[in-house]
Amino acid sequence: IWELKKDVYVVELDWYPDAPGEMVVLTCDTPEEDGITWTLDQSSEVLGSGKTLTIQVKEFGDAGQYTCHKGGEVLSHSLLLLHKKEDGIWSTDILKDQKEPKNKTFLRCEAKNYSGRFTCWWLTTISTDLTFSVKSSRGSSDPQGVTCGAATLSAERVRGDNKEYEYSVECQEDSACPAAEESLPIEVMVDAVHKLKYENYTSSFFIRDIIKPDPPKNLQLKPLKNSRQVEVSWEYPDTWSTPHSYFSLTFCVQVQGKSKREKKDRVFTDKTSATVICRKNASISVRAQDRYYSSSWSEWASVPCS
Amino acid sequence: RNLPVATPDPGMFPCLHHSQNLLRAVSNMLQKARQTLEFYPCTSEEIDHEDITKDKTSTVEACLPLELTKNESCLNSRETSFITNGSCLASRKTSFMMALCLSSIYEDLKMYQVEFKTMNAKLLMDPKRQIFLDQNMLAVIDELMQALNFNSETVPQKSSLEEPDFYKTKIKLCILLHAFRIRAVTIDRVMSYLNAS
């Protein structure tokens, strides 16, 4: 048993039929010695008396909020949560496997630049009675600070008959140098509690591997005289690391017809302009990627040809 | 993805082209190692990230762009002697770059060159003949070192009398390639920055 936060404890259980469970001793936080009684989840059934209560925790029926009382007055509470281990594997019932980039991916993270700021998100089909807390560090044996905000519900989506809830959190490495070469990964740890069930999820990554620039900005077309060609120009996104001559981007320019089946023309360039042929009803899109380290491409920025 | 090949103008900062070739070569070699050594721990998640130049060179700090010198997190061990020799500077005056930066890059290349050559000698003795270092990568390292044109003592190639452990050698190759790729990215960024200065 270990303390998750004040008055909240996690009991780790091997989960199989007729498992013996864990013996837990609860102590009432009071100077009182006599006349103390214990209840579970504010039911009227008295579980025991005395300053300590010994319980055998085997299943969810044994978890919950234990309260010690004296003469109708509440003295203290202890909330017991369960962390299930089945066949040697901790349960992952609360979050959805996003299966990208590989199976058992519960947390996904992205950074818009090398500033040490990143966002992580996760999915669940659970709508209420759910709390998350997020911790992060650089490295694990001698951890360096990363500060994370509170996880918030960032999106709700309908998937077939079911609703899916996306939560996200923003974190910032306390002392990040954008030019640094990372040798220790960022560790992100999410504690998830659904009713009386506790689970934890982790992700480990280098900022360089989760970079996804914002789309190029100010995408503009300039028709070239007496030609079907246009000069497309754009700028680095505002959120990208500076100086741009050090943190350089490369770009992909795509001409796409109205129909998805039409052949796409693609040009790759390190410049912030390109000359392409603009077909009728087509659109021109540009996306960006770190020029030297091939992490994710940005989303497309698009303009119509007309 | 193949990085776009830049054809430098005669007046262009001469090392940019070489550094781009270096990054392309090390990225290709790393990809080849990952594929060939698929049953070895050779991915970024699996390996220990070791830097053989740690405490010997200070490339990141020495080559920091001026704009980042205001960032205290980047300044833990910043040296500030501004000098401008080395042929890559091609008589450009620059307040950003110091000889320390280019010589630090040169020292990095020299260290990796020695390590790779030693390792290749071991890999050539492997009866499985599973993987060898790409000669192109070694050549590109050499070309960039020549372009940098720093004179320094030759580091003797390490020779080892004991029987090589080929499994360990291949793991070390992965570690080395990952670290060298990261350093090659830094070198490319530096050269790009210098070229724009």
Epitope: D41, Q42, F60, G64, V74, T125, I126, S127, N162, K195 | -
Partner: antibody, heavy 117, light 107 residues
Framework: EVQLVQSGAEVKKPGASVKVSCKAT????????IEWVRQAPGQGLEWMGG????????NYNEKFKGRVTMTADSSTNTAYMELRSLRSDDTAVYYC??????????WGQGTTVTVSS | EIVMTQSPATLSVSPGERATLSCKAS??????VAWYQQKPGQAPRLLIY???NRYTGVPDRFSGSGSGTEFTLTISSLQSEDFAVYYC?????????FGGGTKVEIK
């Protein structure tokens, strides 16, 4: 002892509103959700929504959104469920129940609402 | 929305016999399932929560099992006071949903 006591039966005309109360005693009101469940004559149970006074959260069944409002008064430990624009098919017994970790463990006695012109 | 489907709709059993009631969820609800008993003119009464945990004061002839999408309520030896309607309910994801109910009647 935990108890949930509901207000008495109501007869309403179509288009009118009804507000049912549920007074909770014997436990810390703020620690639990009060859920509202209805049962039309001879039918099964249908969940309408819930209200947590502790967190100020509501959780409504989409089917009743816009027509139902759930509130509470912590000074009297009383929860309320108001249903507007009543129709004849809203004729049912309306139950309040407390919920936290163990399902809906205590229920009110039910309030019969009859909608008839 | 998660749909809970109970079967059979009616179960005719003699006193002293075993009754097995089934409940299927349209998607996984982990073990967040409760079972309720309702007698005519009364409010429902909680029997089982977290799929297999007997609520305080519920006789041990009642037992629940299952996780994911398939759940079972078993009454090992029916007593006269057990003839009633039984509902399963998921509170894994909102909107909470009840099954249509299984009426256990005297054979």
């Amino acid at each position: 002892e935990v108890q949930l006591v509901q207000s008495g039966a109501e007869v309403k005309k179509p288009g009118a509103s009804v507000k049912v109360s549920c007074k909770a005693t014997g436990y810390t009101f703020n620690d639990y959700w009060i859920e509202w469940v209805r049962q039309a004559p001879g039918q099964g149970l249908e969940w309408m929504g819930g209200f947590s006074h502790g967190s100020g959260s509501t959780n409504y069944n989409e089917k009743f959104k816009g027509r139902v409002t759930m509130t509470a008064d912590s000074s009297t430990n009383t929860a309320y469920m108001e249903l507007r624009s009543l129709r004849s098919d809203d004729t049912a017994v309306y139950y309040c129940a407390r919920r936290r970790f163990r399902g809906m463990d205590y229920w009110g006695q039910g309030t019969t609402v009859t909608v008839s012109s | 929305e998660i749909v809970m489907t109970q079967s059979p709709a009616t179960l005719s059993v003699s006193p002293g016999e075993r009754a097995t009631l089934s409940c299927k969820a349209s998607q996984s609800v982990s073990n967040d399932v409760a079972w309720y008993q309702q007698k005519p003119g009364q409010a429902p009464r909680l029997l089982i929560y977290y799929a297999s945990n007997r609520y305080t004061g519920v006789p041990d002839r009642f037992s629940g099992s299952g996780s994911g999408t398939e759940f079972t309520l078993t009454i090992s030896s029916l007593q006269s006071e057990d003839f009633a309607v039984y509902y399963c309910q998921q509170d894994y994801s909102s909107p909470w949903s009840f099954g249509g109910g299984t009426k256990v009647e005297i054979k």
